[in-house]
């Protein structure tokens, strides 16, 4: 049954009332308000915005709104000693320097405290040497360089284009290859869509625009100095040498005008194939070093950024549940931005603000949700998901016992083509049912449902007539809730057409040009896509907090487990001889998946038939649903990644943004043909199959009849 059975309900107080209260014009106003100055984590401006949001959430009617502060490791450029890269001649003279900052967008020329482009947490250093172009710096790019082309990156400065994978993975790969510095740049092939003007005339990246971002490899640790525990007043902090995930070599980002000057002189090997060529008028030679006439010139990095323990502030709002106040549905998104945050994060924060206002309006009229809803404005997401992770570490005991679901609310848009959803399989049916009830904002789909336009534009690759829903990866604040704590999670936003726009993310991501005007002029002038995202996110929260039976379908987990087992088995079967030699069998995993499928099916039948008027039985069934996600958590975590504990999903070891299924087995199999000790390697594969099979079986048993 749905929400209209919720507590204190009157005909007026249902999902429709909540959705009808959401207004595009309010989201627009909130976005404007949140984007007039920078809100960098750890700054006074972001503290002031936290207090403003606290005050407004109270006005909107939440029961309580508190600030939760932590002292975490952040990173900033040196104000008097700017970071830059130069080309130096044989005498050591700088004959070319990269930009010190981006040219400001129109109307923002007099804004102070715009942080110049930098790679957060880069160590200081002034390495100089020959350049090697490493494409996207993915694992496979370094394989191509080292194994096929026999190019050694040791002692070289590598230049990599942004895109395809998380920048932290690029830096980790470069470090492992022996590089002594990394230059990251935005190639027009990835950040300039054909036929669109650059900002301020369109939504493309100008030549002087640069993507900021952290380059950590935290693997879910949160604050690098206090892994596993909150960075509170009495925290024990590691020394910087023991800090988690910090890069060991200097890193700096540049725009494509500056990249042109570095790449145009490149000599050495030609690019291995066309996939290594971007859109600049340069040869994309790999190097090492510059061509003939310029061979005595070197590249020098000048990096002077500092790491500093700094106070950050989350805003936590509570709307107490009327029936199950000890069950928490969380809606959270970050507040800190690199500069103005026109899209990331404020297009999401503005939507959260309007959702809070709508819930508050209903509450003022006497309504309460069945379960408690927690609203969060996270700090320091851009510096490694720090605010959300520290809060979850501080409240982990409550969350693991009471956490029903977490809905993420970062950027509401990355395009204006169709909906994009990543979530636990438990939420598939919730998302399908909700989007069938919402109107599509898309041109050509007037009067049609969101489900219909979404399915048409982004069809599921497996199931006809259904939309694509992706796996959760990481790179956002749901990470600690899903990957560490096993709380069912989901995220939704409007996206671009991935078929026609192959660029990575959106072109102005993390640049100074991510302004209110970018959104209002080019992405969503009517704020209709923002409103739709508010309806999806808010609608999911409403249903999760209000429906008598939790809107989770465990049968959908059974379906994907079978698909993931088939996939990992087929990867393993690329090595049939070794599987035979080392007696590798997936029987236990397939058996566990079969058992899960049968038990989930029976549970779903019982769910239809049980007496919902019996509060004890209702609570028991809901707890089985709530704790199902938790059952996929292995307390020991994944190998070398103790904070990634979900056995079914983890961020890819090669790209933090992407989700990998059965990650323990996947990583054990990855590049196994190159392992020096095959017996040991295949032994680890067998161990990971065992862990996965056990976990799936154990999870299945949580759905069995209790006695």
């Amino acid at each position: 049954k749905s929400s209209n059975e919720a507590t204190n309900i009157t005909p007026k107080h249902n999902m429709k009332a909540f959705l009808d209260e959401l207004k595009a014009e309010n989201i627009k106003k909130f976005l404007y308000n949140f984007t007039q100055i920078p809100h960098l984590a750890g700054t006074e401006q972001n503290f002031q915005l936290a207090k403003q949001i606290q005050s407004q959430w109270k006005e909107f009617g939440l029961d309580s709104v508190e600030l939760a502060h932590y002292d975490v490791l952040l990173s900033y450029p040196n104000k008097t000693h700017p970071n830059y890269i130069s080309i130096i001649n044989e005498d050591g003279n700088e004959i070319f320097n990269t930009s010190l900052f981006e040219p400001p967008p129109p109307g923002y020329e007099n804004v102070s405290d715009i942080v110049p482009p930098f790679s957060a947490f880069s160590p200081q250093g002034m390495p100089e040497g020959d350049l090697v172009y490493v494409n996207y710096a993915r694992t496979e790019d370094f394989f191509k360089l080292e194994r096929d082309m026999k190019i050694n990156c040791s002692g070289k400065i590598v230049i990599a284009r942004y895109g395809k994978v998380f920048r932290g993975n690029k830096v980790k790969n470069a470090q492992l290859a022996g590089a002594k510095g990394v230059i990251l740049y935005s190639d027009p092939a990835d950040y300039f869509a054909p036929g669109v003007k650059s900002y301020p005339d369109g939504w493309n990246l100008p030549g002087g625009g640069v993507q900021r971002g952290n380059i950590l490899n935290l693997n879910g640790a949160g604050d690098p100095l206090t892994p596993g525990y909150p960075a509170n007043e009495y925290a024990y902090r590691r020394g910087i040498a023991e800090a988690v995930g910090l890069p060991s070599i200097p890193v700096h980002p540049i725009g494509y005008y500056d990249a042109q000057k570095l790449l145009e002189k490149m000599g050495g090997s030609a690019p291995p194939d066309s996939s290594w060529r971007g859109s600049l008028k340069v040869p994309y030679n790999v190097g090492p070093g510059f061509t003939g006439n310029f061979s005595t010139q070197k590249v020098k990095m000048h990096i002077h950024s500092t790491n500093e323990v700094t106070r950050i502030y989350n805003v936590i709002g509570t709307l107490r549940g009327a029936v199950e106040p000890d069950r928490y549905v969380i809606l959270g998104g970050h507040r800190d931005s690199w500069v103005f945050g026109g899209i990331d994060p404020q297009s999401g924060a503005a939507v959260v603000h309007e959702i809070v206002r709508s819930f508050g309006t209903l509450k003022k009229e006497g309504w309460r949700p069945r379960r408690t809803i927690l609203f969060a404005s996270w700090d320091a997401e851009e510096f490694g998901l720090l605010g959300s992770t520290e809060w979850a570490e501080e409240n982990s005991r409550l969350l693991q016992e009471r956490g029903v679901a977490y809905i993420n609310a970062d950027s509401s848009i990355e395009g204006n083509y169709t909906l994009r959803v990543d979530c636990t399989p438990l939420m598939y049916s919730l998302v399908h049912n909700l989007t069938k009830e919402l109107k599509s904002p898309d041109e050509g789909f007037e009067g049609k449902s969101l489900y219909e336009s979404w399915t048409k534009k982004s069809p599921s690759p497996e199931f006809s007539g259904m939309p694509r829903i992706s796996k959760l990866g990481s790179g956002n604040d749901f990470e600690v809730f899903f990957q560490r704590l096993g709380i069912a999670s989901g995220r939704a936003r409007y996206t671009k057409n991935w078929e026609t726009n192959k660029f990575s993310g959106y072109p102005l991501y993390h640049s100074v040009y991510e302004t209110y005007e970018l959104v209002e002029k080019f992405y969503d002038p009517m704020f209709k896509y923002h409103l739709t995202v508010a309806q999806v996110r808010g609608g999911m929260v409403f249903e999760l907090a209000n429906s008598i039976v939790l809107p989770f379908d465990c049968r959908d987990y059974a379906v994907v487990l079978r698909k993931y087992a088939d996939k990992i088995y087929s990867i393993s079967m690329k090595h049939p001889q070794e599987m035979k030699t080392y007696s590798v069998s997936f029987d236990s995993l397939f058996s566990a998946v079969k058992n899960f499928t049968e038990i989930a099916s029976k549970f779903s039948e019982r769910l239809q038939d049980f007496d919902k008027s019996n509060p004890i039985v209702l609570r028991m069934m809901n707890d089985q649903l709530m704790f199902l996600e938790r059952a996929f958590i292995d307390p020991l975590g994944l190998p070398d990644r103790p904070f990634y504990r979900h056995v079914i999903y983890a961020p890819s070891s090669h790209n933090k943004y992407a989700g990998e299924s059965f990650p323990g087995i996947y990583d054990a199999l990855f590049d196994i043909e190159s392992k020096v000790d095959p017996s040991k390697a295949w032994g680890e594969v067998k161990r990971q199959i065992y862990v996965a099979a056990f976990t799936v079986q154990a999870a299945a048993e949580t759905l069995s009849e209790v006695a």
């Epitope: 004959i95 070319f96 320097n97 990269t98 930009s99 010190l100 900052f101 981006e102 040219p103 400001p104 129109p106 020329e109 003007k197 650059s198 900002y199 301020p200 005339d201 100008p206 030549g207 002087g208 005008y257």
Partner: antibody, heavy 119, light 107 residues
Amino acid sequence: QVQLVQSGAEVKKPGASVKVSCKASGYTFTDYYMHWVRQAPGQGLEWMGYFNPYNDYTRYAQKFQGRVTMTRDTSTSTVYMELSSLRSEDTAVYYCARSDGYYDAMDYWGQGTTVTVSS
Amino acid sequence: DIQMTQSPSTLSASVGDRVTITCRASKSISKYLAWYQQKPGKAPKLLIHSGSSLESGVPSRFSGSGSGTEFTLTISSLQPDDFATYYCQQHIEYPWTFGQGTKVEIK
């Protein structure tokens, strides 16, 4: 090849208006900004403003706000700069110059139009 | 507005000389500085943009350097065709502003 051809010299009385044209050829007209820069006799260069033919946006230097208007005729790939309420200090050579984008330097210039303001 | 100050105002030099002109900005303009050459009765001609990027067709004896607030234009070996007035201009922030010019004349 890229060419910016400006209209001929003008002599105007104080208080009058002048409209100088700049006809572009050899490139896609709407892909480039058009700037106007003036130079008083024996003096340096002074930026007056730009016109963006892609979206008809203009930006004028504070000094000329309210007196200058920049327009276009797409059919002839021509940009116009009109300066009103002329005074003797407006006697100068007026140049149009194009730039690739909002942040790019002016790579091609017109030959200049001499405007003399005299009673 | 950003003030641009050039020095010297006039420079006397001979063919073959190495010539350096300095341009200072009243606040940091990163590397967004252009240099133009103007001959009497002619329109300015772009030599260098973004501090050090040589415009195509401009002889390699012209070079630009600098970052932040201090920039220089260098002519490595002055040629007869180089006697002209040179202007710097910041192209990072509107209104765009020029230096007052440096006249390079024959010694």
